[in-house]
């Protein structure tokens, strides 16, 4: 329930923050999960844990592992479980799927890209920014604070970018590297009120209890780029990320898509080992733009297994 | 934000039950974190009554004996108090309130609770 | 159950001056390096709510006007310099062990 994916290179440093909600000051014990051996504290430590954080420094292949964390207190201990991946760095340029972080979008109005992971480590400016591999020259690109921006992006800006920094502790130095895609929205166009094409108004998609279920919103506004469009899935009207359940999930980043030259969105919603109580809720499809909004509701039911007799 | 809102009635009579809502928006109560009843009296004296922690288990104040009780609708979003046998001793205004480690973090508005014949 | 004793019970403090509250606990609510002790303000008609956790960590939006200090059974919440809307019911509550308990409240107004 309370587990997060973390990767990294070797040879990086890479900083784990316990996915179970604490609050600053209250001790945070780390054990790595295969031997429930305790993650020493001290800084002299490759592996140390820090608080809510745990940094490998730098990180090893070997590392790879589930960590737990508990946050201590004296009436109720909190424990978490971080999922750690150290990979090989890669001789060639490819960034493999499996250390992108989530995609962006970006016009020529917002050309924004974030370093992901940023923010745990004690780092500072400037950061350096490569776009498949080789560095960013030129007056277009300035990297400030944790993000890059780009002046008059074209098409031709689409890619993957990787933000390098260094990060500090106790006067040592280590290398970080993250990569996410970008990818650019074409300017020219008009917007419509938004088409949701999935799901169907009032659409009772049936689900097997205990497997993982799918619920694909899929919107149109306009032509081209779309100054403000999304779609996104709201729990009981409540959104996703502030429902707080863990087994439910928007999919990182809305896929765009031009269908018969139309501007589109879809967010999937994963369920993760769908429950009972999952088919209480209310799931509604939402998608607005500056000409409004339109929800379209869906109710789960549940699909009976086919009954295999001999 | 964690947002707490409180509902029940504001008058009950002597030996009957007291029973309170505390819905819940912008958090899962099966997420994480405990989800308390707290009455505060007349002379402002407050009072925790008890938790029911996202995985539905229970503690309460043994000042309350078995008079008292919480559950929840995880489906509402909604957890509920239970106080069996009131008395007068028991006018005051209840407040349900989240707690993410020790501290209660976030608060419901408060109902006011006269125990009266 | 663990004794939380305020004192004073009410307080007048000038504007731009110190306000000083105590809490004692009939046992120590400290250990592993920690005390268990938490500080809240109720103004009229509302909620408490809270502004110091662990005897001296700043809640998240509270003003750094509010600090805490203390360990074992003796308690501090300091309030430097007094503002008018600092005018308030403030409790101290422990979570050492169950029951949960709160301090009586130390009624602070403005002189």
């Known amino acids: 329930k309370f587990s997060k994916q973390s990767w990294g290179l070797e040879n990086e440093a890479l900083i784990v923050r316990c996915p179970r909600q604490g609050k600053p000051s209250y001790t945070v014990d780390w054990y790595y999960s295969q031997t429930n051996k305790s993650i020493p504290t001290q800084e002299r430590n490759r592996v140390f844990a820090s608080g809510q954080l745990l940094k490998f420094l730098p990180a090893a292949v070997a590392d790879s592992g589930i960590y737990t964390c508990i946050v201590r207190s004296p009436t109720f201990n909190r424990t978490g479980y971080a999922n750690v991946t150290i990979y090989k760095k890669q001789s060639d340029c490819n960034v493999p799927d499996y250390l992108m972080y989530s995609t962006v979008s970006g016009s020529e109005k917002n050309s924004k890209i974030y370093c992901p992971t940023i923010d745990l480590y004690n780092w500072t400016a400037p950061l350096e920014w490569f776009k498949n591999c080789q560095a960013l020259q030129g007056s277009r690109y300035r990297a400030h604070k944790s993000f890059l921006v780009i002046d008059n992006v074209m098409t031709e800006d689409a890619g993957d970018y990787t933000c390098k920094f260094i990060h500090n502790e106790n006067g040592a130095n280590y290398s970080v590297t993250a990569t996410r895609s970008f990818t650019v929205k074409d300017e020219q166009g008009f917007s419509l009120f938004p088409v949701i094409g999935a799901p169907a108004q009032n659409e009772i998609k049936e689900v097997e209890i205990g497997k993982n279920a799918n619920l694909t919103c899929s919107a149109c506004f306009g032509k081209g780029t779309q100054f403000l469009a999304a779609v996104l899935w709201q729990l009981n009207g409540t959104k996703i990320t502030d429902f707080g359940e863990p087994r439910i999930q928007q999919e990182e980043g809305q896929n765009q898509s031009f269908s018969n030259g139309l501007a589109c969105l879809d967010m999937v919603l994963r369920i993760a080992d769908v429950k009972e109580e999952d088919l209480l809720l209310q799931y509604d499809c939402l998608a607005l733009n500056l000409h409004g909004l339109r929800r379209h509701t869906v109710r789960l039911s549940r699909k009976n297994p086919i009954d295999h007799h001999s | 934000d964690v947002q707490l809102q409180q509902s029940g009635p504001g008058l009950v009579k002597p030996s009957q039950s007291l029973s309170l809502t505390c819905t819940v928006t912008g958090y899962s109560i099966t997420s994480d974190y405990a989800w308390n009843w707290i009455r505060q009296f007349p002379g402002n004296k407050l009072e925790w009554m008890g938790y029911?922690?996202?995985?539905?288990?229970?503690t309460y104040n043994p000042s309350l004996k078995s008079r008292f009780s919480i559950t929840r609708d995880t489906s509402k979003n909604q957890f509920f108090l239970q106080l069996n046998s009131v008395t007068t001793e028991d006018t005051a205004t209840y407040y349900c309130?989240?707690?993410?480690?020790?501290?209660?973090?976030?608060w419901g508005q408060g109902t006011s609770v006269t125990v009266s014949s | 159950d663990i004794v939380l004793t305020q004192s004073p019970a009410s307080l007048a403090v000038s504007l731009g001056q110190r306000a000083t509250i105590s809490c004692r606990a009939s046992?120590?609510?400290?250990?592993?390096?920690?005390?268990?002790m938490h500080w809240y303000q109720q103004k009229p008609g509302q909620p408490p709510k809270l502004l110091i956790y662990l005897a001296s960590n700043l809640e998240s939006g509270v003003p750094a006007r509010f600090s805490g200090s203390g360990s074992g059974t003796d308690f501090t919440l300091n309030i430097n310099p007094m503002e008018e809307e600092d005018a308030a019911t403030y409790y101290c509550q422990h979570s050492r062990e169950f029951p949960f308990t709160f301090g009586s409240g130390t009624k602070l107004e403005i002189k």
């Open positions: 029911i922690d996202y995985s539905g288990s229970t």
């Open positions: 046992k120590s609510v400290s250990t592993s390096g920690h005390s268990y």
């Open positions: 309130a989240s707690t993410v480690i020790d501290s209660m973090d976030y």
